[in-house]
């Protein structure tokens, strides 16, 4: 008996699909980086499964992940950020599946925040601004942002605008008058680093003014 696998033999365990995906977040907590991995199949029995990362680390050869419910997580300063690391799913000492990954190619930025929309009556436009923690970071500074907005009644009819700054102007004439809009923003690495879209920021809601019948313009909010 191997002693590794409970709830069935290790041979049975090897038939399961242990494919997983990971994302990194650099300087997510001061100078600390994080790495989060999860199985692609939510039905995998994770009872005895552990994750380990080896290689491209500082002062250690390997690190073990912490298990947080369905995800596996590391927060550390010890990522070299040069070269590929080997991330393995393990049962005891046995590796079930491994991936060689450069952590700078799976970066998921932090979600933007402080999204707001201000109507400029004189300019007949809306100024959208938001903030990102990445402006203060040493590594993942340059992001592409995706601003998405929709009329609240249009469930899946989002309009997307890509931009590299944290300010966007929406022309009043492009929006429906006297309508409630929802707007949100997310970010992705755009220079040197590769990876995934961040989570969406919290949505912001704003109403467009009525049309002023005499001038054909909208009333301010």
């Amino acid at each position: 008996e191997s002693g590794y696998a409970q709830n069935g033999d290790l041979e049975d365990a090897e038939l399961d699909d242990y494919s997983f995906s990971c994302y990194s977040q650099l300087e997510v907590n001061g100078s600390q980086h994080s790495l989060t991995c999860a199985f692609e199949d939510p039905d995998v029995n994770i009872t005895n499964l552990e994750f380990e990362i080896c290689g491209a680390l500082v002062e250690v050869k390997c690190l073990n992940f912490r298990k947080l419910q369905e995800i596996y997580f590391i927060e550390t300063k010890k990522f070299l950020l040069i070269g590929k690391s080997n991330i393995c799913v393990k049962v005891g000492e046995k590796s079930l599946t491994c991936k060689k990954i450069d952590l700078t190619t799976i970066v998921k930025p932090e979600a933007p925040f402080d999204l707001s929309v201000v109507y400029r009556e004189g300019a007949n436009d809306f100024v959208v601004t938001f903030n990102t923690s990445h402006l203060q970071k040493k590594y993942v500074k340059v992001l592409m942002h995706d601003v998405a907005y929709r009329q609240e009644k249009d469930e899946n009819k989002w309009t997307h605008v890509n931009l590299s700054s944290t300010k966007l102007t929406l022309l009043q004439r492009k929006l429906q008058p006297a309508a409630m809009y929802e707007i949100k923003v997310r970010s992705i690495p755009d220079h040197y680093f590769k990876g995934f879209w961040s989570e969406w920021s919290p949505s912001y809601y704003f109403r467009t003014p009525e049309i002023n019948n005499s001038s054909g313009e909208m009333d301010p909010i």
Partner: antibody, heavy 117, light 110 residues
Framework: QVNLRESGGGLVKPGGSLRLSCAAS????????MHWVRQAPGKGLEWLSL????????YYADSVKGRFTISRDNTKNLLYLQMNSLRAEDTAVYYC??????????WGQGTLVTVSS | NFMLTQPHSVSGSPGKTVTISCTRS????????VQWYQQRPGNSPTTVIY?????PSGVPDRFSGSIDSSSNSASLTISGLVTEDEADYYC?????????FGGGTKLTVL
Amino acid sequence: QVNLRESGGGLVKPGGSLRLSCAASGFTFDDSVMHWVRQAPGKGLEWLSLVGWDGFFTYYADSVKGRFTISRDNTKNLLYLQMNSLRAEDTAVYYCARQGDYMGNNWGQGTLVTVSS
Amino acid sequence: NFMLTQPHSVSGSPGKTVTISCTRSSGSIDSSYVQWYQQRPGNSPTTVIYEDDQRPSGVPDRFSGSIDSSSNSASLTISGLVTEDEADYYCMQYDFHHLVFGGGTKLTVL
């Protein structure tokens, strides 16, 4: 098959400059960490510099920091080493090396740089 | 910064076994992987051991690597010596974002 070929070496006077190139083929260049290592005549290996896959991360040995600059052009599969303020002690065979997928490196055949008046 | 110290030279007869040591001056030898390179005269280096004890494909199993925490050193052992093993051997470790090479050991096959 991994192939690395250095060029640009030669004779240069002290205080002069030289740019070495390393042409890469047989592997995914824009996925690889690259290094420059040198070997003075009859001496051991000395690591000089590395560059990350994207050019963002660059690091140097103290002996060349401020004088040498590593760079890469992923569109052409080329690695460079710009060497300024050269000294007699910089005379060596210069190798480019690929850092494999967290295993052994692959090395070029080297190019000789001679710094002499 | 640490140094990796190797004996200047070792020798052995064909068929015999030799061991080349690589001692780290400060910090733990366990803190990053050790690689070993072989450099035959007039050639560029090639990897014979990576990740402490792993052999690249094509390297004979006569080559083995190990780590000894108690002596803070790594070792390269070559058994069944043949004349083609005559070369310089270098150990190497990462030191943060720098690479540190040992001074090299000349192996002579008598």
